[in-house]
Structures are given as structure tokens and as C-alpha cells.
């Protein structure tokens, strides 16, 4: 099938980084500077992508394959082969049509990327809070309300259970 | 092709104004939210500012707050920077940049910029 498809068709032997000249008697001829084909048979070149402001060069463009970019530091890429760069902020923010803001109380973020999210309700678990939040950091939660209590030992009665859904303020 | 071209830029002294531009061919502006980027010398790119299609909201980084104004007018194709009251600290080159389909949406990047414009500020 192959030598039947190349006698029909004398483009089909053009190799990748080549393109058949229809000017030129269906000639291979190589892609012209900033143009790549990736696969042989093509009958044009594609225009190599330009990685240039919010974008930087990860991988030169060759005449067999197209340029590679990810974003310049201070944005992130986003997207399939780097389609978009997004900004950057700190922990402790999230990313808004505004700029960059501080996480609201009650929610955190520890990378630069991404929402603020709230913070664990150890509670939901009957834990308590060993270590509270912060902007950057989720709380850390310990051990039950009941396992904190003083004395409580096989000697000495437990105390009493808290309510379910309440934690130490 | 999409593209955007900037220009504008210069050498001026502190307190003094620049207004920059930025040509758009090969899309339709008014479906994009626009913004300017900036990168100081040996520093990273920072966001300065954004404006929706339509021009009705716009947006600053806060250290150009009340100095620098983004403008677009689609039929000219064409985005602006005012800047006033210019800083040593706002030397860099400044990018004019296109937010990407669902920008504001479900993220905010950029798909599209150019090759910038060099803005100067010294004595």
C-alpha cells in the first residue's frame, strides 16, 4: 500500500522539516526559517510559535518540531502546552480580577497559585484545635475535647462529653 | 496573525508622564479583557493593571493606583497606559497582554503579548 500510495502520490516521501513544493513540481523542499513540520507528507510548513513577553523560550523551534514555552517567573503556565500564564501571589492570597488579595479570615492558602480555602473544622471530627490557622497555613488539629480533659484515667470518671459540633473557643 | 504591538516608551524624568499604546490585529478586541504587565530589570513580571471589554471596569496593582490609567478604544483596536507621577521605581518594560477565553471566569491568564516597550524613568 505504502509503494502504491508514494507512485500516486511523490509528496508522501517527503520527510518531517520538509514540505512539498507545489511550485516546484512537488519537489521536497525544506521549511523556510521559523516554520516546522513535525510529519512527513505535509504540503506546507507551520508558523513556530513565538514565546515572547509574558512567555519564554523552553525549547527552540526546529524545522522538525515547534517551540516549547513556559511563563517568565512571576506568572505560572495554565493550559495544555503552556496555552495561558497566570500571576503569581503569595501564600497567604488569592488571585483575583483585582490583583492578587489576602486570603479573608477563616481561609488559607500555601501556595502561589490557586484560592484561599477554608480552614479544617476540627470539630466535624470531634477533634479540637491544637494549632490555629493563619493566612498561609490550615489549623492543626489534635486530639478530642474528651482525651484533653485532666484526670481522665481507669481511677478517675471521664468527664463529660461536649456537645457534638462545638469546639473550645 | 494575532498580535500586539506596543509603543510609547522612553527615557523621562521622575514626575513626569508617558502614555503608551498597543496595537491589536488578527482578533476582535472588544471580546477581551486586556491588561499591562511590567518586568523591572532583573526582576520578575509583575501585573500592573486590567480593563474589561467594554472599558466599565478596570483595575490596578496598588503601587500605580491613582498615577497610571487604562484606556482601550475598540474601534481603533487599540489599548493605552497613561502613566503620571512616574518613579526610578517604575523602570521596566511594560507588555501589553490579552486575558484568555474565560478570563475572570475560571482563571486569569494571559495568551497573548508582545515584545514591549522600554519605559526609562531616571534624571
Known amino acids: 500500500f505504502e509503494r502504491t500510495r508514494s507512485l500516486q502520490d511523490p509528496c508522501s516521501n517527503c520527510p518531517a522539516g520538509t514540505f512539498c513544493d507545489n511550485n516546484r513540481n512537488q519537489i521536497c523542499s525544506p521549511c523556510p526559517p521559523n516554520s516546522f513540520s513535525s510529519a512527513g507528507g505535509q504540503r506546507t510548513c507551520d508558523i513556530c510559535r513565538q514565546c515572547k513577553g509574558v512567555f519564554r523560550t523552553r525549547k527552540e523551534c526546529s524545522s522538525t518540531s515547534n517551540a516549547e514555552c513556559d511563563c517568565t517567573p512571576g506568572f505560572h503556565c495554565l493550559g495544555a502546552g503552556c496555552s495561558m500564564c497566570e500571576q503569581d501571589c503569595k501564600q497567604g492570597q488569592e488571585l483575583t480580577k483585582k490583583g492578587c488579595k489576602d486570603c479573608c479570615f477563616g481561609t488559607f492558602n500555601d501556595q502561589k497559585r490557586g484560592i484561599c480555602r477554608p480552614w479544617t473544622n476540627c470539630s466535624l471530627d470531634g477533634k479540637s484545635v491544637l494549632v490555629n490557622g493563619t493566612k498561609e497555613r490550615d489549623v492543626v488539629c489534635g486530639p478530642s475535647p474528651a482525651d484533653l480533659s485532666p484526670g481522665a484515667s481507669s481511677v478517675t470518671p471521664p468527664a463529660p462529653a461536649r456537645e457534638p459540633g462545638h469546639s473550645p473557643q | 496573525q494575532v498580535q500586539l504591538v506596543e509603543s510609547g516608551g522612553g527615557l523621562v524624568q521622575p514626575g513626569g508622564s508617558l502614555r503608551l499604546s498597543c496595537a491589536a490585529t488578527?482578533?476582535?478586541?472588544?471580546n477581551y479583557w486586556m491588561n499591562w504587565v511590567r518586568q523591572a530589570p532583573g526582576k520578575g513580571l509583575e501585573w500592573v493593571a486590567n480593563i474589561n471589554q467594554d472599558g466599565s471596569e478596570r483595575y490596578y496593582v496598588d503601587s500605580v493606583k491613582g498615577r497610571f490609567t487604562i484606556s482601550r478604544d475598540n474601534a481603533k483596536s487599540s489599548l493605552y497606559l497613561q502613566m503620571s507621577s512616574l518613579r526610578a521605581e517604575d523602570t521596566a518594560v511594560y507588555f501589553c497582554?490579552?486575558?484568555?477565553?474565560?478570563?475572570?471566569?475560571?482563571?486569569?491568564?494571559?495568551?497573548?503579548s508582545g515584545q514591549g516597550t522600554t519605559v526609562t524613568v531616571s534624571s
Open positions: 497582554a490579552r486575558g484568555g477565553e474565560g478570563y475572570g471566569v475560571d482563571h486569569y491568564g494571559l495568551d497573548v
Open positions: 488578527g482578533f476582535t478586541l472588544s
